[in-house]
């Protein structure tokens, strides 16, 4: 709490300007009127106040708006946003994308703080869904934003927003998240032709089921090994050697380097050695010739 002291003669702030830059903590408290500060918030950003000075200015706004700041003030918080707590932000009602952008700009180049996470959460909940413009904005500032959402939260992303997603935005997504995003991407890109479709859908394929991978194998897509290694193991296992060969095209040779890693390792174990030998890659570990393979899961389903 800043001690209440009278403002020294001649130091009363008539406007928020550079003359305040070196005011002491108590001088700012005594000489800056909260209502003046609120109406001239847009000027605070242009003055290189210290963190301690920003604390004093925040304290003034808190006294003026105990129930939470109006959006007209929030939009111009600038560096004062760095002093806000998640509890402060939960009192806000942020509806404008411009306000969101302005506050994210302040935090640019830094990791997502609890304050930013709370702000985004408030904004998205207020909108009801993660629309394309919001997603565009958020992934521009935080490429990993999409992968920070739970599968439940991702379910509110409309397919139209998927167009805003870049491959790097999905780098840290886990299979559960891709399971939700893949059907949306499939819907979003459904009217594209084969090669263009594959370029767009490639980043989402970690959520693709077996039947879609089989369909892709008929389209000469030449999937690279990095993408193949991110596919769901349960989706890869039912693929035949011929289907994997068609799916990977010239990249099939890369299987040898990955034969000890999932999903390649598990897929090899499910293939006949005879079939693997046709690839000429020296892949070992397939089902020996003459052995009969019983699919027990199918047996159980039938009974």
């Amino acid at each position: 709490e800043v001690e209440k002291t009278a403002c020294p003669s001649g130091k009363k702030a008539r406007e928020i300007d550079e003359s305040l830059i070196f005011y002491k903590k108590w001088e700012l408290e005594a000489c800056v009127d909260a209502a003046l500060l609120a109406t001239q918030m847009d000027r605070v950003n242009a003055i290189p106040f210290t963190y301690e000075q920003l604390d004093v200015l925040k304290h003034k706004l808190d006294e003026l708006y105990p129930q939470g700041y109006p959006e007209s003030v929030i939009q111009h918080l600038g560096y004062l946003f760095l002093k806000m707590s998640p509890e402060d932000i939960r009192k806000w009602n942020v509806t404008s994308l411009e306000t969101l952008k302005a506050l994210l700009e302040v935090n640019k180049g830094h990791e997502m703080s609890p304050q930013v996470a709370t702000l985004i959460d408030r904004f998205v909940k207020g909108r009801g869904q993660l629309d394309k413009d919001t997603l565009d904005t958020l992934t521009a500032f935080y490429p990993g934003y999409l992968c920070s959402l739970s599968p439940e939260e991702l379910s509110s992303v409309p397919p139209s927003s998927i167009w805003a997603v870049r491959p790097q935005d999905l780098d840290t997504c886990d299979p559960r998240q891709l399971d939700v995003l893949y059907p949306k991407a499939r819907l979003a890109f459904q009217n594209m032709n084969g090669s263009e479709y594959f370029v767009k859908i490639q980043s989402f394929l970690g959520g693709a089921p077996t039947e879609d991978l089989k369909a892709l194998s008929q389209q000469n897509v030449s999937m690279d090994l990095a993408t193949f290694m991110k596919l769901r193991t349960d989706a890869v296992l039912p693929l035949t050697v011929a289907e994997v060969q068609k799916l990977l095209g010239p990249h099939v040779e890369g299987l040898k380097a990955e034969e000890r890693h999932r999903p390649v390792r598990d897929w090899i174990l499910r293939q006949r050695q005879d079939d693997l030998d046709t690839l000429g890659l020296g892949l070992q570990g397939g089902i020996p010739n003459g052995y009969l393979v019983l699919d027990l899961s199918m047996q159980e389903a039938l009974s």
């Epitope: 550079e18 003359s19 070196f22 242009a46 290189p48 210290t50 963190y51 301690e52």
Partner: antibody, heavy 122, light 106 residues
Framework: EVQLLESGGGLVQPGGSLRLSCAAS????????MSWVRQAPGKGLEWVSA????????YYADSVKGRFTISRDNSKNTLYLQMNSLRAEDTAVYYC???????????????WGRGTLVTVSS | IQLTQSPSSLSASVGDRVTITCRAS??????LAWYQQKPGKAPKLLIY???SLESGVPSRFSGSGSGTDFTLTISSLQPEDFATYYC?????????FGGGTKVEIK
């Protein structure tokens, strides 16, 4: 090229005066608050004074208050430090330094001059 | 605000992991910067906001901490890293520097 170049240092007797200059180039000088930082021989760094971008506001460390005056001429891209009533303990290398960002609470320095030595001795 | 650096000097070999600490007399959030200074040269900014690496600074340098206790770490000391390191707080005026830590060759 972005740089700062100090000049004006030298040997002066106790009680004497010196005026240091710092010529800036390669950035929009008037947009940045500027500082003087000094370093006594074999010692650490001490922030001496600062001035706002327009030159309208100034700050001084207690050790130099009332004796030193910081100023700037934005038309010449030059920062000054007028040092009066010099004492032996003012002997140091004086650096001018630029804040990394023109805005925000980021009072750290990404650009420093090479420094100019001020020696106060009889 | 007073900043106390420790140790004031240390001897290390190339390849060593080096840790320097800086303690503030009161909380300063993450308003701390680290500089490297070589003899006869001006200080060079390494780290700002306690943990953000300045552009062009090798990734072997890292910073951590918040509040009153901060650390500068050099993961694998290189010949060019032998120098004096200073912390600086920018939470409030007057801006203050730590006393410095001299890293010497063992």
């Amino acid at each position: 090229e972005v740089q700062l170049l100090e000049s004006g240092g030298g040997l002066v007797q106790p009680g004497g005066s010196l005026r240091l200059s710092c010529a800036a180039s390669g950035f929009t000088f008037s947009s940045y608050a500027m500082s003087w930082v000094r370093q006594a021989p074999g010692k650490g760094l001490e922030w001496v004074s600062a001035i706002s971008g327009s030159g309208g506001s100034t700050y001084y460390a207690d050790s130099v208050k009332g004796r030193f005056t910081i100023s700037r001429d934005n038309s010449k891209n030059t920062l000054y430090l007028q040092m009066n009533s010099l004492r032996a303990e003012d002997t140091a290398v004086y650096y001018c330094a630029k804040r990394r960002d023109s805005y925000g609470p980021y009072w750290y320095f990404d650009l420093w001059g090479r420094g100019t030595l001020v020696t106060v001795s009889s | 605000i007073q900043l106390t650096q420790s140790p004031s000097s240390l001897s290390a070999s190339v390849g060593d992991r080096v840790t320097i600490t800086c303690r503030a007399s009161q909380g300063i959030s993450s308003a701390l910067a680290w500089y490297q200074q070589k003899p006869g040269k001006a200080p060079k900014l390494l780290i700002y906001d306690a943990s953000s690496l300045e552009s062009g600074v090798p990734s072997r340098f890292s910073g951590s901490g918040s509040g009153t206790d901060f650390t500068l770490t050099i993961s694998s000391l290189q010949p060019e890293d032998f120098a004096t390191y200073y912390c600086q707080q920018f939470n409030n005026y007057p801006l203050t520097f730590g006393g410095g830590t001299k890293v010497e060759i063992k």
